[in-house]
């Protein structure tokens, strides 16, 4: 099969600090040296890019300085962390993997991870 399969967890619950982590794993049909990983958010049939990073196989994954994402790569597996999440950011986060080089190019799109974010309750005033 010429397509690339991408696997990611169906559901993840963000921490009380608004941090969610999940693994995006792809079955590479070719020997890529350059890979691009993009996290997309799908809400109400609208798709937006959350963050993206291109990395050379064997090297570290680097997102832009102002990105809300961080990640590490190991073989065909990428560990993604999204921070600064709030309840309104709850939604489906799709992992998109592109084998950019060498040719041929391959595209792989995961089914998405539903990330649930619950805003922490404000701390009650205390008399300490």
């Amino acid at each position: 099969c010429k397509a690339m399969h991408v696997a990611q967890p169906a559901v993840v619950l963000a921490s009380s600090r608004g941090i969610a982590s999940f693994v995006c794993e792809y079955a590479s049909p070719g020997k890529a040296t350059e890979v691009r990983v993009t996290v997309l958010r799908q809400a109400d049939s609208q798709v937006t890019e959350v963050c993206a990073a291109t990395y050379m196989m064997g090297n570290e994954l680097t997102f832009l300085d102002d990105s809300i994402c961080t990640g590490t790569s190991s073989g065909n597996q990428v560990n993604l962390t999204i921070q600064g999440l709030r309840a309104m950011d709850t939604g489906l986060y799709i992992c998109k993997v592109e084998l950019m080089y060498p040719p041929p190019y391959y595209l792989g799109i995961g089914n998405g991870t539903q990330i649930y974010v619950i805003d922490p309750e404000p701390c009650p005033d205390s008399d300490f």
Epitope: A3, E34, V47, T54, M100
Partner: antibody
Framework: QVQLVESGGGVVQPGRSLRLSCTAS????????MDWVRQAPGKGLEWVAV????????YYADSVKGRFTISGDSSKNTLYLQMNSLRAEDTAVYYC???????????WGQGTLVTVSS | EIVLTQSPGTLSLSPGERATLSCRAS???????LAWYQQKPGQAPRLLIY???SRATGIPDRFSGSGSGTDCTLAISRLEPEDFAVYYC?????????FGQGTKVEIK
């Protein structure tokens, strides 16, 4: 809203060159793959070339490899197709198209006609 | 290169009828990376379906896509006058991107 406007088409003799432009607006150019697709008169669609993101990666159809060069200027939000050594079979309407985030070409320009004839 | 073959070449139907268009790939290609386009004379193509079954923004629900393995289908449940056009399938899972030769849906 997203808009793609091509220009630069015209009549050119075989062996000569032409440069097409596609001005994009309404989106961040560097977040998408940008493609050229052509359609010969009365025929179907044929993908020509793609340029991705930072512009380092470019792929071409075998039919144009070595003759056509795709490039982009993100500061001007403009896509280019430099066509050299043109042949009669390159006669077509050339469309620029945006690669959708989840695949497919989600926006297309109106097209520009290139006629290669002596 | 993945070759896409569309059938039939021409489909003659009346408004209100159902249209079923087929797209077959020369080799196993995930239907997740297949798109359908509509093109009217003198106009640019318009994306209808991506990922084999997801409707693009603004596309009415009378258009639906399905498929698995090497076969994909575009269905138009009730043809409206504006649906008479040429339809193309395209695969975008691996380079080079390829299109089918098109199916013309004409008024009977």
């Amino acid at each position: 809203q997203v808009q793609l406007v091509e220009s630069g088409g015209g009549v050119v003799q075989p062996g000569r060159s032409l440069r097409l432009s596609c001005t994009a607006s309404g989106f961040t150019f560097s977040s998408y793959g940008m493609d050229w697709v052509r359609q010969a008169p009365g025929k179907g669609l044929e993908w020509v070339a793609v340029i991705w993101y930072d512009g380092r990666n470019k792929y071409y159809a075998d039919s144009v490899k070595g003759r056509f060069t795709i490039s982009g200027d993100s500061s001007k939000n403009t896509l280019y197709l430099q066509m050299n050594s043109l042949r009669a079979e390159d006669t077509a309407v050339y469309y620029c198209a945006r690669g959708g985030l989840l695949g497919g070409f989600d926006y297309w320009g109106q097209g520009t006609l290139v006629t290669v004839s002596s | 290169e993945i070759v896409l073959t569309q059938s039939p070449g021409t489909l003659s139907l009346s408004p209100g009828e159902r249209a079923t268009l087929s797209c077959r790939a020369s080799q196993s290609v995930s239907s997740s990376y297949l798109a359908w386009y509509q093109q009217k004379p003198g106009q640019a193509p318009r994306l209808l379906i991506y990922g084999a079954s997801s409707r693009a923004t603004g596309i009415p629900d009378r258009f639906s896509g399905s498929g698995s393995g090497t076969d994909c289908t575009l269905a138009i449940s009730r043809l409206e006058p504006e649906d008479f056009a040429v339809y193309y399938c395209q695969q975008y899972g691996s380079s080079p991107w390829t299109f089918g030769q098109g199916t013309k849906v004409e008024i009977k």
